[in-house]
Interface confidence: low
Amino acid sequence: SRGQYSREDNNCTHFPVGQSHMLLELRTAFSQVKTFFQTKDQLDNILLTDSLMQDFKGYLGCQALSEMIQFYLVEVMPQAEKHGPEIKEHLNSLGEKLKTLRMRLRRCHRFLPCENKSKAVEQVKSDFNKLQDQGVYKAMNEFDIFINCIEAYMMIKMKS
Amino acid sequence: SRGQYSREDNNCTHFPVGQSHMLLELRTAFSQVKTFFQTKDQLDNILLTDSLMQDFKGYLGCQALSEMIQFYLVEVMPQAEKHGPEIKEHLNSLGEKLKTLRMRLRRCHRFLPCENKSKAVEQVKSDFNKLQDQGVYKAMNEFDIFINCIEAYMMIKMKS
């Protein structure tokens, strides 16, 4: 059997400490622009509702976080930057901190697993392509191993 | 605050029972073609190694399952079908069972979370677009709520 590759969970052991610091940095960066947008926001309804928090705390947490970071970086901040060079500067700083957070979360795989590809699957695909015709026979012959994998996955999902 | 929408976790409570049945159906369907591909497979090395099983059992389990189902449906089976009408018929049946499994897993969100979008995020994006300019102000004004969401997510990830 192929040797296990390293997961490169660097920055994971000391992550809880760094996490508080990163969130504090985000809050500080946001405080630079909060008053400006507070004044501009004329509507009473809430955009980021309890439903969103529940998704963050549930089994869709990773997707919610990943999509919301992308949403702020791609859709919100570029439009918000149009309010002058000073606001743009602060938003750039906020955006960079958000990107840094995402990068660190990605590096420590268990924090953003939905953004990581399975290396083992990549290896299967690579081997499959190298084997040409024999790859099809082998993959089909081993379909029962695949069923065992599905079973193992589902067992864990039922326990979690 | 907007009312919570239903998660539509239909088929989840009785899923453990259905799961065994679905896997048994997959195994039975595979048994129809196993001998054929066993004879054709001339290589000793294993394609689906323990590394794959470990990814299925780890935090990349959902990605591994999602990618492997796609791999078999799109890359392996269409090539394997070329071995005559009888094999093609059995493989169609096997493929349908695999698609049914995926569909049921998707329906019970916690089993394939990586293939599900956060409905709360979709709602945020929809509301944001409806609000036009005010959406930008609101989204930026509520950035601290977003930070709270990130914090909640990370706390859960550190506990798990």
Partner: antibody, heavy 119, light 106 residues
Framework: EVQLVESGGGLVRPGGSLRLSCTAS????????MAWVRQSPDKGLEWVAS????????YYRDSVRGRFTISRNNAKTTLYLQMDSLRSEDTATFYC????????????WGQGVMVTVSS | DIQMTQSPSLLSASVGDRVTLNCKTS??????LAWYQQKLREPPKLLIF???PLQAGIPSRFSGSGSGTDFTLTITSLQPEDVATYFC????????FGPGTKLELK
């Protein structure tokens, strides 16, 4: 300090009922899955039932399914096991246990409570 | 169901000895195995999870190894307070426990 304290055990006739309770302290109860495990001299340790942290899902061993009901009250930080149609083979010490986060090993156990089913 | 066997069922050893307890499963469970210590009239206490990591607060003389179907719990230098019954527990498929190894002093 994590503490799990069981109560409600005792002697009951075959076919009778008992309700076990487990009061938790020293940790955030709603953050953990909980389970009941029993131990008898003849069968050793046996997992009985589990419940998810928000009580959405419950799981039972085959021999107790339909007779036992696991439940929890997060506000009261209490886990329950309602046991009906008791049989002599249910005689055991019942332990309240905690699942660590989303993992599945049992990291803390209560002192246990004795359940005797006999005529 | 996954069957579990432990050997030996009874082990007599002296203080300071290196002690090895074995656990075997009927199928591959990878590293989904925990070890517990149970003293007389006490509940089981978690020592090891995921085959080798030591639970917080457990002395470093305890260590776990193995994966697949064969697992080992080692006590490098036996202490009087280690007299107990030791159970292995698999959580790969369902939840089952080994029958236990009773460890006593010679």
């Amino acid at each position: 300090e994590v503490q799990l304290v069981e109560s409600g055990g005792g002697l009951v006739r075959p076919g009778g009922s008992l309700r076990l309770s487990c009061t938790a302290s020293g940790f955030t109860f709603s953050d953990y899955h909980m389970a009941w495990v029993r131990q008898s001299p003849d069968k050793g340790l046996e997992w009985v039932a589990s419940i998810t942290l928000d009580a959405t899902y419950t799981y039972y061993r085959d021999s107790v399914r339909g007779r036992f009901t696991i439940s929890r009250n997060n506000a009261k930080t209490t886990l329950y096991l309602q046991m009906d149609s008791l049989r002599s083979e249910d005689t055991a010490t019942f332990y309240c246990t905690r699942h660590r986060g989303f993992s599945v090993w049992l990291d803390y156990w209560g002192q246990g409570v004795m359940v005797t089913v006999s005529s | 169901d996954i069957q579990m066997t432990q050997s030996p069922s009874l082990l007599s050893a002296s203080v300071g000895d290196r002690v090895t307890l074995n656990c075997k499963t009927s199928q591959n469970i990878f590293e989904n195995l925990a070890w517990y210590q149970q003293k007389l009239r006490e509940p089981p206490k978690l020592l090891i999870f995921n085959a080798s990591p030591l639970q917080a607060g457990i002395p470093s003389r305890f260590s776990g190894s193995g994966s697949g179907t064969d697992f080992t719990l080692t006590i490098t230098s036996l202490q009087p307070e280690d007299v107990a019954t030791y159970f292995c527990h698999q959580y790969y498929s369902g939840y089952t426990f080994g029958p236990g190894t009773k460890l006593e002093l010679k």
